[in-house]
């Protein structure tokens, strides 16, 4: 017999199956071109001295063989004597160690047995009712396939699954979706309904993230407020990296987790835009305002759980940066302007009340006045800061008020609203003898003292009712007592106290009369 032909003679070895556990298996035969065919198989056991014979029986009952030698793959043409248009039965007999080992038989029509390709192009991945759906275009001229997938996680081996019958120009597969771990998938195809048809190679890996992106485990720190009224938000701990299966390590499109930073500026609620979303890598500068910060993780299936923090407002105050003048028409604030064409947000709230009660006003873009100051005015009728109580005022500035990360803090300070000069008048002034020529004057703290930095000083005035001579004594804002000395016995005096702010002189308290009694010696 010619080596290129199937030999219709008895094979050159005895016909007896040893029934051993080793031997040929997984015989696959298919057409590889218009007129050429290939059969391949696997051999289990020691391969030394093994000769393989591909056996073929035609539908007529005639049988032949190809001698393959030690090879486990054999090609032949449609002229080799094997009927390719009709059903044939093929198997492998391996002669080894004076015994014959047989593979299971496959019965097929060779011409219609085509070697299938795996999915070749772009495999689209989506989520459908809690499962993973993969979809791809059927390779040319290969409609009608059985499709398998295999999948693994970073900690588990490959497992096989079934994609169901495919009979269209596009093929798809429903697969399991893991909640918290990434998976690597591969797909393979074979001709439908053709027993013995060979599986294609596995496709390239398809890397799939978990249904839930990993929760970000990050920590932030905020630097001190700089001279420019801004502070840098810095990331202290990077988000944990997703563990990937072996075939997805390195470049693994599909499993990427993106982390975004969502800023919500709580202060100055009257501004146009309160929230902004940024990439986590681009850490922003913030004003001294209060913020809520959320880190949102997301993958191709959407966002996951987020982690949120509260960044409190910077409460460092400027003692004298803000000038406030109260006139008959209303009140005007002055402060050093930041730059040309700045929008300012003035926010105030009563001290000791919940931050949610803040009120604010947004100015139109303004340039500095000739003195380099920016201003904000309001009438008494507006009711702004009209109550006689302490207010905390913060002024923010931005050249681009629509951009949340471009606001800066100009100043933070306290202001006593309403008629501060009258409201601040000290009460309960009392005079006690201290010595033969001095008295101690005490008073209750002014309401202004509840407002940090507002009370500049107390002034105590003493008037000699005889000579009409007046003396004034400045007292530190933290003190509520002074000793008046050099007084004369038997003379009537009146004493008054007032509380002054940096920009307002206070109203004197009610005059308090006293005198030092003349001491009569025995």
């Amino acid at each position: 017999c010619r080596t290129s032909e199937c030999c219709f003679q008895d094979p050159p070895y005895p016909d007896a199956d040893s029934g051993s556990a080793s031997g040929p298996r997984d015989l696959r035969c298919y057409r590889i071109s218009s007129d050429r065919y290939e059969c391949s198989w696997q051999y289990e056991g020691p391969t030394a001295g093994v000769s393989h014979f591909l056996r073929c029986c035609l539908s007529s009952g005639r049988c032949c063989y190809f001698a393959a030698g030690s090879a486990t793959r054999l090609q032949f043409s449609d002229q080799a004597g094997v009927s390719v248009l009709y059903t044939v039965t093929l198997w492998v007999e391996s002669w080894a160690r004076n015994q014959t080992e047989k593979s299971p038989e496959v019965t097929l029509q060779l011409y219609n047995s085509v070697k299938y390709e795996p999915p070749l192009g772009d495999i689209k991945v989506s989520k459908l009712a809690g499962q993973l759906r993969m979809e791809w275009e059927t390779p040319d001229n290969q409609v009608g396939a059985e499709v398998q997938f295999r999948h693994r996680t970073p900690s588990s081996p490959w497992k096989l699954g079934d994609c169901g019958p495919q009979d269209d120009d596009t093929e798809s597969c429903l697969c399991p979706l893991e909640m918290n771990v990434a998976q690597e998938f591969q797909l393979r195809r074979r001709q439908l309904g053709s027993q013995g048809s060979s599986w294609s190679k596995w496709s390239s890996p398809v890397c799939v993230p978990p249904e839930n992106p990993p929760q970000p485990q990050v920590r932030f720190s905020v630097e001190q407020l700089g001279q420019d009224g801004r502070r840098r938000l810095t990331l202290k701990e990077q988000p944990t990296q997703l563990e990937l299966p072996e075939g997805c390590q390195g470049l693994a499109p599909g499993t990427e987790v993106t982390y975004r930073l969502q800023l919500h500026m709580l202060s100055c609620p009257c501004k146009a835009k309160a929230t902004r979303t940024l990439h986590l890598g681009k850490m922003p500068y913030l004003s001294g305002a209060a913020y809520n910060v959320a880190v949102i993780s997301s993958n191709q299936f959407g966002p996951g759980l987020n982690q949120t923090w509260h960044i409190p407002a910077d409460t460092h105050t400027e003692p004298v940066a803000l000038n406030i003048s109260v006139g008959t028409n209303g009140t005007t604030m002055y402060w050093p302007a930041r730059a040309q064409s700045m929008t300012y947000c003035i926010e105030w709230q009563p001290v000791g009340q919940d931050g949610g009660l803040a009120t604010c006003s947004l100015t139109a873009p303004q340039d500095p006045d000739p003195a380099g100051m920016a201003t904000y005015s309001w009438s008494r009728e507006s009711g702004a800061m009209g109550q006689e109580k302490c207010y905390y005022i913060t002024i923010f500035a931005s050249a681009h008020p629509e951009k949340l990360t471009l606001w800066s803090t100009v100043l933070s300070t306290y202001h006593f609203g309403g008629n501060a000069s009258a409201a601040g008048t000290p009460h309960h002034v009392s005079v006690k003898n201290h010595s033969l020529d001095s008295v101690s004057v005490d008073w209750a703290p002014s309401l202004l003292s509840t407002c940090p930095g507002v009370l500049k000083e107390y002034v105590v005035r003493c008037r000699d009712e005889d000579s009409k001579q007046v003396s004034e004594h400045p007292v530190q804002p933290t003190e509520t007592q002074v000793t008046l000395s050099g007084l004369r016995a038997g003379v009537a005096y009146t004493v008054q106290v007032r509380a002054d702010t940096a920009w307002l002189r206070g109203v004197w308290s009610q005059p308090q009369r006293f005198s030092i009694e003349v001491q009569v010696s025995d």
Epitope: R25, D26, P104, G144, E146, F149, S156, P157, W158, K159, L160, G161, D162, C163, G164, P165, Q166, D167, C173, L174, C175, P176, L192, G193, S194, Q195
Partner: antibody, heavy 118, light 108 residues
Framework: QVQLVQSGAEVKKPGASVRVSCKAS????????IHWVRQAPGQGLEWMGI????????SYAQKFQGRVTMTRDTSTTTVYMELSSLRSEDTAVYYC???????????WGQGTMVTVSS | SSELTQDPAVSVALGQTVRITCQGD??????AGWYQQKPGQAPVLVIY???NRPSGIPDRFSGSSSEDTASLTITGAQAEDEADYYC???????????FGGGTKLTVL
Amino acid sequence: QVQLVQSGAEVKKPGASVRVSCKASGYTFTSYYIHWVRQAPGQGLEWMGIINPSGGSTSYAQKFQGRVTMTRDTSTTTVYMELSSLRSEDTAVYYCAKSNWAYAFDIWGQGTMVTVSS
Amino acid sequence: SSELTQDPAVSVALGQTVRITCQGDSLSSYYAGWYQQKPGQAPVLVIYGKNNRPSGIPDRFSGSSSEDTASLTITGAQAEDEADYYCNSRDSSDNHLVFGGGTKLTVL
């Protein structure tokens, strides 16, 4: 809802054939394989074969090769299983079942009792 | 062709945990499906894949696998869990499917 409804009980004589039907509803008929499983009285489950409702291709367990034929009618979304040359040991409940991605049978028919007796 | 091996019978005290195993070469490549069958009824799928429960199956049923063995665990067995349990898998060498011989679970 997704269901498989089988034809009624049959009594047959040895050597005869039986044809059991299985009507699928509530899902895309051509997208999932249908299997036939039988259970002899007091015995375990035995897989008989598989049919692809899309193309009609089949694969049978070695034990039933030559005696079993599985067909389908896509217009009525019905699968048929015919077993020939019946013998008494073919007395069993025959089930059709739909498989999912894990090769698991997620939907079963109610079963058809086939009795082979002379 | 692959075979799947199950213990013929297992018993468990009410409320205790029981593990039913299924061993076979094909389980190193394929998942096992687990079925509960009560007398006179069709089998019902209780676990498939890695550890998936169809809707309506109580969460006391769980599945696991290691190499060539799959396990069905019932944590806190109830009287209504008394039934026959079968595993199945795809045969690793051909297109066919195979069942284990079944395990009769008795709840004491």
